[in-house]
């Protein structure tokens, strides 16, 4: 007789995630020296260990531990890069400018990007059916602390000048609910962290309008302002034309406004 | 605290000379890092970029192409701008402005706050 399975109401665990962990974690440490003590089995087995077996609308910061410990990585901490609905920008940007970084630009970032997984309670297995949607479930459901856990961190370790990339299409620009606005923003250390300067990106060609006067953006700048942190902003007009100008600032487009 | 600090400006006969300088705060950033420009606004007109430079790459307003020279001296953290036959059209605001990456693709990183540039006939 087939074991009833409990129906969640988001996608099931990606396929081979096992492997794809795996595999991620050793393209990841060969390619990143300071990365190399690492042990990809011993991070498998921590990642596994901390949703196996468990409720998936049960899980804690602390399932997360072991292998927060395992994948701990020292980033410069003046080079951070936060985004918020706007990802693939922000991972091209940090593919050129190579000493900023991006959560996905660390291991535990990388190991995660894309993917979705939970288990069963009292069971070895692995969901490949289902896992819970944190609207329509549950929150604490094993991606989403694994997301909140080490947005935290990552957000706990910048210091100097902290960037984020905004997407100027949303109708929130800025969303008290997104991972940024729900949990790194009030993770910056005001003791370490100067000023966080968002690059708010537009969307249309003919959009010209200053969007760092959006209403959102002023409730960033509130929330921030009031934990003691300078805020600025910046418009990024034309994202291509950004994107071409990190890559070589030399370009004679560059020094021209056309 | 004031970034970008503009010198040089003044009232001039047309067919003179003036040398515009810009001077950065060495703690907030160095020029040579930067993407330096000039910009004038005349009254009733938009702002627009007439010379900017980074590293070997310089570019020039055709208005002012052959006139207007934009230099720097990095030991200094200074951009200049040297202004040759100048005409009554010439007359504006002149501002300094910097970027990390470039000009023209979003709002710039730092502005002067502007010197008068007057060309009488």
């Known amino acids: 007789v087939p074991r009833w399975r409990q129906q969640w109401s988001g996608p099931g665990t990606t396929k081979r995630f096992p492997e794809t962990v795996l595999a991620r974690c050793v393209k990841y440490t060969e390619i990143h020296p300071e990365m190399r003590h690492v042990d990809c089995q011993s991070v498998w087995d921590a990642f596994k260990g901390a949703f196996i077996s468990k409720h998936p609308c049960n899980i804690t910061e602390e399932d997360y531990q072991p292998l927060m410990k395992l994948g701990t990585q020292t980033v410069p901490c003046n080079k951070i890069l936060l985004w918020s609905r706007i990802k693939d920008l922000a991972h091209q940007f940090t593919q050129v400018q190579r000493d900023m970084f991006t959560l996905e630009d660390t291991l535990l970032g990388y190991l995660a990007d894309d993917l979705t997984w939970c288990g069963e309670f009292n069971t070895s297995k692995i969901n490949y059916q289902s896992c819970p949607d944190w609207r329509k479930d549950c929150s604490n459901n094993p991606v989403s602390v694994f997301w909140k856990t080490v947005s935290r961190r990552f957000a706990e370790a910048a210091c100097d000048v902290v960037h984020v990339m905004l997407n100027g299409s949303r109708s929130k620009i800025f969303d008290k609910n997104s991972t940024f606005g729900s949990v790194e923003v009030h993770n910056l250390q005001p003791e370490k962290v100067q000023t966080l300067e968002a690059w708010v990106i537009h969307g249309g060609r003919e959009d010209s309008r200053d969007l760092c006067q959006d209403p959102t953006i002023k409730e960033l700048e509130s929330i921030i302002s009031k934990r003691n942190i300078q805020f600025s902003c910046k418009n990024i007009y034309r994202p291509d034309k950004f994107l071409q100008c990190v890559k070589n600032p030399e370009d004679s487009s560059c020094t021209s406004e056309i | 605290q004031v970034q970008l600090v503009e010198s040089g400006g003044g009232l001039v006969q047309a067919g003179g000379s003036l040398t515009l300088s810009c001077a950065a705060s060495?703690?907030?950033?160095?020029?040579?890092?930067?993407?330096m420009g000039w910009y004038r606004q005349a009254p009733g007109k938009q702002r627009e970029l007439i010379a900017a430079?980074?590293?070997?790459?310089?570019n020039y307003a055709d208005s002012v192409k052959g006139r207007f020279t934009i230099s720097r001296d990095n030991a200094k953290n200074t951009v200049y701008l040297q202004m040759n036959s100048l005409k009554p059209e010439d007359t504006a605001v002149y501002y300094c402005?910097?970027?990390?990456?470039?000009f023209g693709y979003g709002d710039n990183d730092y502005w002067g706050q502007g010197t008068q540039v007057t060309v009488s006939s």
């Open positions: 060495r703690s907030i950033f160095e020029i040579n890092t930067m993407t």
């Open positions: 402005s910097a970027d990390r990456y470039g």
């Open positions: 430079s980074r590293g070997a790459t310089t």
